[in-house]
Amino acid sequence: IWELKKDVYVVELDWYPDAPGEMVVLTCDTPEEDGITWTLDQSSEVLGSGKTLTIQVKEFGDAGQYTCHKGGEVLSHSLLLLHKKEDGIWSTDILKDQKEPKNKTFLRCEAKNYSGRFTCWWLTTISTDLTFSVKSSRGSSDPQGVTCGAATLSAERVRGDNKEYEYSVECQEDSACPAAEESLPIEVMVDAVHKLKYENYTSSFFIRDIIKPDPPKNLQLKPLKNSRQVEVSWEYPDTWSTPHSYFSLTFCVQVQGKSKREKKDRVFTDKTSATVICRKNASISVRAQDRYYSSSWSEWASVPCS
Amino acid sequence: RAVPGGSSPAWTQCQQLSQKLCTLAWSAHPLVGHMDLREEGDEETTNDVPHIQCGDGCDPQGLRDNSQFCLQRIHQGLIFYEKLLGSDIFTGEPSLLPDSPVGQLHASLLGLSQLLQPEGHHWETQQIPSLSPSQPWQRLLLRFKILRSLQAFVAVAARVFAHGAATLSP
């Protein structure tokens, strides 16, 4: 058993049929010694008396809010949560496996630049009695500070018969060094509590590996005289690290109709302009990627050919 | 060329060669990007490699003030990785063919380090750790880790030379 926060405790249980469970001793936070009784949740049934209560925790029925009282007055609470371990593996029932970029990916994180700011998100089908707490650091043995905000519900989607909820959190490294080569990964830890179930999820990454620039901005077209060709120009996204002579992007320019199966023109460039062939009913799209490190491409920025 | 005395390097040549190094580092093992090597407990293997750190002057402001600190750091790293790529880790079993991207990478690391430091001038270099894994599978894993680390190192070096070519060239 360990303390998650004040008056909230996590009991780690090996979860299998007829498991013996864990013996837990609760102590009432009071100077009083006599006349103390214990109850669980809203029940008035007295579970025991005395300053301490010893219980055998085996299942969710044994978890919950234990309260010690004296003469009708509440002295203190202890909330017991369960953390299940099945076949040596901690349960991951609360969050959905996003399976990208690999199986058992529960947390996904992205950064728009090298400033040390990043966003992580996760999915669940649970709608109520759900809380998250996020901590982060750079490195684990001698951790350096990363400050995370509160996790918030950022999207709701319908997937078949199920509703899916997306939560996200923003974090910022306290003393970021955008130009340095990272040697210690960022660690992100999410505590998830659903009713009386506790689970924790972690992710470890370098900012450079989660970079995904915003799409290029201000796409403009200039038809070339006596030619089917069009000069397309754009600018670096505002959110990208500066100066651009140091933090350079490379671009993919594509002309395509509405369907992915349609024919296309495509060219890669390090410049902020390119010459392509425009077709009626097609769009010109541009996306960006770090020029020197193969992290994710941005989403496309598009303008119609006409 | 960046010499210890403090003259400027051939920024544009260094830019071209460092960009080539980036391409080679990714073609040497593109799938490395999809392996989570941190799960393999690599502290003892890749923590010894030289990293371009915050105080090394490789940021735009540091380069403007005095590029020598940064160039020396990059030179140390290039020599270090050049030695690693020529070591038993890469020459032992399972063997690499002579024209593999690792071979080209090795040659390009040497080429850039020579551009930065002509013969007759010597910056101190970092000792190469004695990493000689006994099993071929350990060697393979170590190669992946070294290449992954090299990808990050050459990305920073390429940014330095691109910025230098754009803003510090005579």
Epitope: R261, K263, K264, T275, R279 | S27
Partner: antibody, heavy 118, light 107 residues
């Protein structure tokens, strides 16, 4: 199977015009760009131009501008290359090539030898 | 026009050898470079697109790398059917241009 079948060999006199055909099958003709590339004997490849059969848009290499015409007939799924004012250095194998992507060549015809000789 | 220069113009090699062909562009072309194989009397065949992207149906012994101005095509463990002429082609700008070719001959 995507295929391009070209017309047979031609012998032409200097100053004449040649018209070669390229019949497409195995795909929707207007879904691919059609290019023409030539190769002189024992020489390399030389791109001549392209057509978008969907709308008839064309682009030619400056070297051939004014002498070359590329057309496409969507009713017969056939592309054509017409080269006028022939000279001896136009002796070459002419290939049609197609792709959904404009700038490289995925499918090739078998080639048509054009000999220009007096 | 962008000039493409291939080297060597010919190379003699044996079955099982590893062969590397290089292609240099007269100006930076990012990764807008493609490789073709041509056998005598036949049309060219696409091997690699955009410098390093593999083509379905092309054996994995063919690989490409490079960006900017310098590119290479590597044939890992040469097979009897690989003796042919290889061409690079830039697609950075029109007119599309090819390298002069590299003939891979039997030693």
């Amino acid at each position: 199977e995507v295929q391009l079948v070209q017309s047979g060999a031609e012998v032409k006199k200097p100053g004449a015009t040649v018209k070669i055909s390229c019949k497409a099958s195995g795909y929707t003709f207007s879904d691919y760009y059609l290019h023409w590339v030539r190769q002189a004997p024992e020489k390399g490849l030389e791109w001549m131009g392209w057509i978008d059969p969907e709308n008839g848009d064309t682009e030619y290499a400056p070297k051939f501008q004014g002498r070359v015409t590329i057309t496409a007939d969507t009713s017969t799924d056939t592309g054509y290359l017409e080269l006028s004012s022939l000279r001896s250095e136009d002796t070459a194998v002419y290939y049609c090539a197609a792709n959904k992507e404009l700038r490289y060549f995925d499918v090739w015809g078998q080639g048509t030898l054009v000999t220009v000789s007096s | 026009d962008i000039q493409m220069t291939q080297s060597p113009s010919s190379v003699s090699a044996s079955v099982g050898d590893r062969v590397t062909i290089t292609c240099r562009a007269s100006q930076s072309i990012s990764i807008n470079l493609h490789w073709y194989q041509q056998k005598p009397g036949k049309a060219p065949k696409l091997l690699i697109k955009f410098a390093s992207q593999s083509i379905s149906g092309v054996p994995s012994r063919f690989s490409g790398s490079g960006s900017g101005t310098d590119f290479s095509l590597t044939i890992n463990s040469l097979q009897p059917e690989d003796f042919a002429t290889y061409y690079c082609q830039q697609s950075n700008s029109f007119p599309l241009t090819f390298g002069g070719g590299t003939k891979v001959e039997i030693k």
